[in-house]
Interface confidence: medium
């Protein structure tokens, strides 16, 4: 397949940054595209064979090299006026126009590294009203105050990641929409049966992987360096009054 | 060589049929359709080469115009999983692809028994913090942003409890303002009256209840998945 690394990349303005793209499909041709929010794909550069690359529609501020068939690194130079975007790499065989894409790299460039903040994460417990009204329980996870918006949120129950019953906002929300480098927030819901929530042995954890500064990035602020890190919040199930292990087991067996 | 895609946005109900279009003034030797989910790379769905060609892929039907200047994608009985950006691309003279801007498709789920409600949830660590959850509303209901910049309201998202074959819509609102209340958090959205359900005051010794539990967590996990 095609791999792009890293998935998220963060840089200070004025620095060159290189995005990697590797393919093991034995394809001669490789392509770099830029995609801005809500937009289609715009071709930056493409290469039909080793040592061979051509400018696309928006090559200014970018450079590429193609020493190997498998690799087509893209350098976003300091001359690029608006580098923050989603970058996609693709490859194809010379005989076909069918392109196969990598997973993409999200690049964010900021004026100042002091704008970088990791998220604060909180888990909110289900409302008793929801439990009595629907026999279901929704936990809400809130990640707030982070910049850039390079986060991945996941739910873990009793130590295992879960996907069923989960819904996460498709995009983080700007906390101050008018600001360029506004911090962001993101919410997610996990819904389980009331009986499952009401077992105090069940452990619920919301995990947010934040992609921030690397060890090499300079940091002069007096707060902790906002490096790439995992931030979590948790909750334990809560038994309802008059709820016994027998009635719980009954709930499990009938579910 | 430009490719025009229409419509730019399309929002339909689960189970409905739809057609999206891709047109150009130029002739293309071949044409591709891709589907892209947010934050992911596009995935190739099909390539059409011959004018007048029709290709079927389960519920998706692709057609290439006789003059090789246009193409259509028809989806039968759309599913929420069909949601995404549909991109068409034509073979350029340079061995590169010319991409259209895409059609953003949103397939709204059928909510079986909508039961709209707003609930207040408390932070598991500090009881003075809370969020408001608007849930179980039908897919026709739109959630509006707050006019107050200090109140945050998320877009609605769909949640699928696969083990219970149950889908629901929900949105979340919160604020640091002292006068923020769940009862009117979603007032800008057109929602039914009396949807706010305040939590009853709980008055029992949870410690006593917890003592009686000796449950197998693996069994619990099976119940969840």
């Amino acid at each position: 397949g095609i791999t792009q690394s890293p998935k998220y990349l963060f840089r200070k303005e004025g620095q060159n940054v290189t995005l990697s793209c590797e393919q093991n499909l034995n394809h001669d041709a490789m392509y770099w595209y830029r995609q801005d929010p809500g937009q289609g794909l715009r071709l930056i550069y493409y290469s039909q064979i080793v040592n061979d690359f051509q400018k696309g529609d928006i090559a200014e501020g970018y450079s590429v090299s193609r020493e190997k068939k498998e690799s087509f690194p893209l350098t976003v130079t300091s001359a690029q006026k608006n580098p923050t975007a989603f970058y996609l790499c693709a490859s194809s065989s010379r005989s076909s126009y069918e392109q196969y894409f990598g997973p993409g790299t999200r690049l964010t460039v900021t004026e100042d590294l002091k704008n970088v903040f990791p998220p604060k994460v909180a888990v909110f417990e289900p409302s008793e009203a929801e439990i009595s009204h629907t026999q279901k329980a929704t936990l809400v996870c809130l990640a707030t105050g982070f910049y850039p918006d390079h986060v991945e949120l996941s739910w873990w129950v009793n130590g295992k990641e879960v996907h069923s019953g989960v819904s996460t906002d498709p995009q983080p929300l700007k906390e101050q929409p008018a600001l360029n480098d506004s911090r962001y927030c993101l919410s997610s819901r996990l819904r389980v049966s009331a009986t499952f929530w009401q077992n105090p042995r069940n452990h619920f954890r919301c995990q947010v992987q934040f992609y921030g500064l690397s060890e090499n990035d300079e940091w002069t602020q007096d707060r902790a360096k906002p490096v790439t890190q995992i931030v979590s919040a948790e909750a334990w199930g809560r038994a309802d009054c008059g709820f016994t292990s027998e009635s719980y087991q009954q709930g499990v067996l009938s579910a | 060589q430009l490719l025009e895609q229409s419509p730019q946005f399309l929002s339909i109900q689960e189970g409905e049929n739809l057609t999206v279009y891709c047109n150009s003034s130029s002739v293309f030797s071949s044409l591709q359709w891709y589907r892209q989910e947010p934050g992911e790379g596009p995935v190739l769905l099909v390539t059409v080469v011959t004018g007048g060609e029709v290709k079927k892929l389960k519920r998706l039907t692709f057609q290439f115009g006789d003059a090789r200047k246009d193409s259509s994608l028809h989806i039968t009985a759309a599913q929420p999983g069909d949601t995404g950006l549909y991109l068409c691309a034509g073979a350029g003279s340079q061995g590169n692809l010319i991409f259209g801007k895409g059609t953003k498709l949103s397939v709204k789920p059928n909510i079986q028994n909508p039961d709209p409600a707003v609930y207040q949830l408390r932070d598991s660590k500090s009881s003075d913090k809370s969020v408001c959850l608007f849930t179980d509303f039908d897919s026709q209901t739109n959630v509006s942003q707050s006019k107050d910049s200090d109140v945050y309201i998320t877009d609605k998202t769909v949640l699928d409890m696969r083990s219970m074959d149950f889908k629901s819509n929900s949105a979340v609102a919160w604020s640091n303002k002292s006068d923020f209340a769940c009862a009117n958090a979603f007032n800008n959205s057109i929602i039914p009256e009396d949807t706010f359900f305040p939590s009853p005051e709980s008055s029992c010794d949870v410690k006593l209840v917890e003592k009686s539990f000796e449950t197998d967590t693996n069994l619990n996990f099976q119940n969840l998945s």
Epitope: V50, N51, D52, Q54, K68 | -
Partner: antibody, heavy 116, light 107 residues
Framework: EVQLQESGPGLVKPSQSLSLTCSVT?????????WNWIRQFLGNKLEWMGY???????NYNPSLKDRISITRDTSKNQFFLNLNSVTTDDTATYYC?????????WGTGTTVTVSS | DIQMTQSPAFLSVSPGERVSFSCRAS??????IHWYQQRTNGSPRLLIK???ESISGIPSRFSGSGSGTDFTLSINSVESEDFADYYC?????????FGAGTKLELK
Amino acid sequence: EVQLQESGPGLVKPSQSLSLTCSVTGYSITSGYYWNWIRQFLGNKLEWMGYITYDGSNNYNPSLKDRISITRDTSKNQFFLNLNSVTTDDTATYYCARGGGYVPVWGTGTTVTVSS
Amino acid sequence: DIQMTQSPAFLSVSPGERVSFSCRASQNIGTSIHWYQQRTNGSPRLLIKYASESISGIPSRFSGSGSGTDFTLSINSVESEDFADYYCHQSHNWPTTFGAGTKLELK
């Protein structure tokens, strides 16, 4: 800076094999790029003959496919041209070059005359 | 194979003049054409890649244009060191092929 230098006999008899060496300095031939042989006939016409890639695979001009072989010795950072059953039509200046689509780096060339 | 036809075979100009070299491909090659200069007893030197893209170290008086089948290399003010042979080269399809060249001579 990468440099390429061709070497080999300047005179070859018809029906014999032509063997040339290209010595590369300033870049490892296994690190990347395609390593080509291109020849220029007496009337100045240029002909691409073939290449060996950094990973050792080949691509040849179909007009020479039955007679040509391009190999390499990675320990010496050299690649080689072998052309069988030569005729007087193979008299030319032979260049080794680094390239893929376009060819930015050429050797100085070596002239080979095919004559009895 | 794709044929590359260069015309004329000879061009005579004086220093300071503008000159254009023509190259025609036997089929549509988009912009997959490159231009080389070869001085007497020298190796070819890459001047322009992909019809119009400049090469670092090459004087800015050299420029290229065209797409599809018809291409032009221009020197906007010829200098004495520019009297040489000029070749076009397509990399659209294998085998990659060269034009027969145009000789730029001093008038």
